[in-house]
């Protein structure tokens, strides 16, 4: 969490941003909130990016003002116009690319004063893994698949019964480049699994950590998965 203040105390407002990550190919959100004003026409929102000459986005007098917008952001940005009045200056970014990573500044002017806060935005690819029993294999085998990751992640297997065990000798992980030649499909196979045990496939890079669990008993198979972004720090 980054909280920024204006320069002179009496005319400063609090602006808060949250470091976040964008999943390339999807739309992303750059979060920013500020002390609201009672009049929309008095609020100015400017989004800037370090190293970019033009503006990322500007919203003033109740509408977008995009004459100074940098070329790389044309048609790709929007604020939540109906939420500006309650202090939401978050920016929506269309079709996130690797090049969108960097330091952004959310700069706010209201009738109460000015304020700004920086935001570190990482870009990559991350997706939920799914673990299945591989019935085609000769021995009891688990297969963990996740469709999109970048940068290349690490994959670690763990089990509830054999806590602390190192499965690197009985697992095999491959990375297959997807059609857009950036992200990769992750496939990891775990051999010699035992019944009545819960196994976890953990995929992690510097942006996200995802886990796929599978519980295999004689009568049922239960699955669970979750994904966590690693750099969601507020500022």
């Amino acid at each position: 969490l980054i909280i920024g203040f204006g320069i002179s105390g009496r005319h400063s407002i609090t602006v808060t941003t949250v470091a976040s990550a964008g999943n390339i190919g999807e739309d992303g959100i750059l979060s920013c909130t500020f002390e609201p004003d009672i009049k929309l026409s008095d609020i100015v929102i400017q989004w800037l990016k370090e190293g970019v000459i033009g503006l990322v986005h500007e919203f003033k007098e109740g509408k977008d003002e995009l004459s100074e917008q940098d070329e790389m952001f044309r048609g790709r940005t929007a604020v939540f116009a109906d939420q500006v009045i309650v202090g939401n200056a978050s920016l929506r970014l269309k079709n996130v690319q690797l090049t969108d990573a960097g330091t952004y500044k959310c700069y706010i002017i209201t009738s109460k004063g000015k304020g700004n806060a920086n935001l570190e935005y990482k870009t990559g690819a991350f997706s939920m893994p799914e673990v299945n029993v591989d019935y085609n294999a000769s021995s009891e085998t688990l297969r963990c698949e996740a469709p999109r990751w970048f940068p290349q992640p690490t994959v670690v297997w763990a089990s509830q019964v054999d806590q602390g065990a190192n499965f690197s000798e009985v697992s095999n992980t491959s990375f297959e480049l997807n059609s857009e030649n950036v992200t990769m499909k992750v496939v990891s196979v775990l051999y010699n699994v035992t019944i009545n045990n819960t196994y976890s496939c953990m995929i992690e890079n510097d942006i996200a950590k995802a886990t796929g669990d599978i519980k295999v008993t004689e009568s049922e198979i239960k699955r669970r998965s979750h994904l966590q972004l690693l750099n969601s720090k507020a500022s």
Partner: antibody, heavy 123, light 107 residues
Framework: QVQLQESGPGLVKPSGTLSLTCAVS?????????WSWVRQPPGKGLEAIGE???????NYNPSLKSRVTISVDKSKNQFSLKLSSVTAADTAIYYC????????????????WGQGTLVTVSS | EIVMTQSPATLSVSPGERATLSCRAS??????LAWYQQKPGQAPWLLIY???TRATGIPARFSGSGSGTEFTLTISSLQSEDFAVYYC?????????FGQGTKLEIK
């Protein structure tokens, strides 16, 4: 009411280039919307080809990226599609469509469509 | 790319009855899903966006639900003009992709 109208040759030779234009009326191509091309082979489903913003920014479907060019002509309020090295597999109805963007909403669904034009690739 | 799978391929329902069409995404698309209706010789027509928001002028008998990977389009009381092909489309991830369609026919 926004209207879109596709135009261009209905027959293209294999290995040639398919060229289509979409004329926009009842609204400005310089609005906040993206403008798309979508195709539908006879009796089959829909496939997004690519999209363009009035500034010239584009997104192309990776499966067609090496063969596709979409351009915009703001003075004529129209945008165009070029698809090179065509084969019989490119025979389809080609639609132009407008992205349904409204402030704060996501981009990507299509609220206005042209009536479509059938392009056949054959010698 | 995200693969959208619609079921059933064909659905036979009598006028006045309820129709339920399903759409599944190969990975989460959040609520970024649209439904279209297409009649023979016509362009698709937007019915639903945001998984559940009806487009302008669409009758209340059309409703959408779901999020993540599982979505449903429900037509509460079928009218004669509702028999057509229905497509779902995800716009969470580029390239935007469509399902293969469900043909709704008169029983």
């Amino acid at each position: 009411q926004v209207q879109l109208q596709e135009s261009g040759p209905g027959l293209v030779k294999p290995s040639g280039t398919l060229s289509l234009t979409c004329a926009v009326s009842g609204g400005s191509i310089s609005s906040s919307n993206w403008w798309s091309w979508v195709r539908q082979p006879p009796g089959k489903g829909l496939e997004a080809i690519g999209e363009i913003y009035h500034s010239g920014n584009t997104n192309y479907n990776p499966s067609l990226k090496s063969r596709v060019t979409i351009s915009v002509d703001k003075s004529k309020n129209q945008f165009s599609l070029k698809l090179s090295s065509v084969t019989a597999a490119d025979t389809a109805i080609y639609y132009c469509a407008r992205d349904g963007y409204s402030s704060g909403w996501y981009w990507g669904y299509f609220d206005y469509w042209g009536q479509g034009t059938l392009v056949t690739v054959s010698s | 790319e995200i693969v959208m799978t619609q079921s059933p391929a064909t659905l036979s329902v009598s006028p006045g009855e309820r129709a339920t069409l399903s759409c599944r995404a190969s990975q989460s698309v959040n609520s970024n899903l649209a439904w279209y209706q297409q009649k023979p010789g016509q362009a698709p027509w937007l019915l639903i966006y945001g998984a559940s928001t009806r487009a302008t002028g669409i009758p209340a008998r059309f409703s959408g639900s779901g999020s993540g990977t599982e979505f449903t389009l429900t037509i509460s009381s079928l009218q004669s003009e509702d028999f057509a092909v229905y497509y779902c489309q995800q716009y969470n991830h580029w390239p935007y992709t469509f399902g293969q369609g469900t043909k709704l026919e008169i029983k």
